[in-house]
Interface confidence: medium
């Protein structure tokens, strides 16, 4: 009871919800639910019945494996999906799949908050701007990743001459996609003309 699997997919993709084990032999009934009590599809005595739901026309059940195919998933499809199987013995068994649908991240824009010579070094404050998304940030100076301590939307650092990089890249990513934005400086400490 209560097996829970997590799945993260990109919006617009086709998804297969299935379990990693074999279905009980000769089960009597199989039902997929959306958020616990809303039936999506039910297989009973060798036929499938699709219920009126937002999935109608977008789902297909494979009774052999119990897999539920959903086409063109959207963020609104985020939910816990439950497959309940009624065995010949009358016992029920259920599996849960928590589906997270994420949009691809947009391309970030790097904004120069501050750049100045400081004690013969270069003080740099860059922000990585994307529309309200929950994402991870990775900053690179040329090809070198900055340390974990600097991985948020604002890069603030003071570089000594031997550590200057020409270009700074912000990589934004979620578990389904990633995009880069880059800004280049003219050494030692000025914005390059584009």
């Amino acid at each position: 009871q209560g097996h829970l699997v997590h799945m993260t997919v990109v919006s617009g993709s086709n998804v297969t919800l299935n379990i990693s084990e074999s279905l009980p032999e000769n089960y009597k009934q199989l039902t997929w639910f959306y958020t616990f009590d809303q039936k999506i599809v039910e297989w009973d005595s060798r036929k499938s019945k699709y219920f009126e739901s937002k999935f109608k026309g977008r789902v297909r059940l494979d009774p052999q494996s119990g897999a539920l195919y959903i086409s063109k998933v959207q963020k609104e499809d985020n939910s816990t999906y439950i497959m309940r199987v009624l065995k010949k013995t009358g016992n029920e068994q259920e599996w849960k799949i928590k589906l997270q649908v994420l949009d691809p991240v947009p391309k970030p824009v790097i904004k120069i908050e501050k750049i100045e010579d400081m004690d013969d070094n270069c003080y740099l404050k860059l922000s990585c701007v994307i529309p309200g998304e929950s994402v991870n940030y990775t900053w690179y100076g040329d090809k070198r990743p900055f340390p974990k301590e600097l991985q948020n939307s604002v890069l603030e650092t003071t570089l000594m001459p031997h550590n200057y990089s020409r270009c700074y890249t912000c990589q934004v990513s979620n578990s389904v996609s990633s995009k880069n934005g880059t800004v280049c400086l003219s050494p030692p400490c000025t914005l390059a003309r584009s």
């Epitope: 340390p147 650092t157 003071t158």
Partner: antibody, heavy 118, light 108 residues
Amino acid sequence: EVQLVESGGGLVHPGGSLRLSCAASGFTFGGYAMSWVRQAPGKGLEWVSLISGSGGSTYYADSVKGRFTIFRDNSKNTLYLQMISLRAEDSAVYYCAKYSNYDYFDPWGQGTLVTVSS
Amino acid sequence: EIVLTQSPGTLSLSPGERVTLSCRASQSVSSSYLAWYQQKPGQAPRLLIYGASSRATGIPDRFSGSGSGTDFTLTISRLEPEDFAMYYCQQYGSSPRTFGQGTKVEIK
């Protein structure tokens, strides 16, 4: 010349609190990340905490998380470490250090001794 | 986290001798982001080498660093009386920053 001078160490009972200070001079303090590193008597060096130049980001070693707070007053060119719920294993010389490009520590202050004992 | 192991623990040597200190990492240190510090009794550590092989400002050229990946070396070509001290390596390729346990160079 860059100078870092720590103060505020002393003897404290287990469970007690202490605030360390580090006065900085000779550089533009607000432009640099700063760190605390400690050294237990006769032992090696252990990174404790880090704060970004603006003070907007702070990071801690697992051993002190939830008990120590690093903060800074850029108008006073001073770095602080507030320590609560102190344990015997926190006994050490505490050094403040300029965190060079978030890489290595250069230079260091002379250190202040914290002793946690009943 | 990356564990750094320094060897030997102690070296007993005479002034004028050549010294080689070893620092071995439990996993590869990216881009040779390794520093060496010197610490004398009652004093703060002092940066000697960064980037595995670059000498810090004001450090005499008898100090040199080498290595990459998991094996790094600090060499003192000719020991001066003021070089007897503790030496620590530190990696800054990944978080948290970690230090080796140190090597003591003492007068024989």
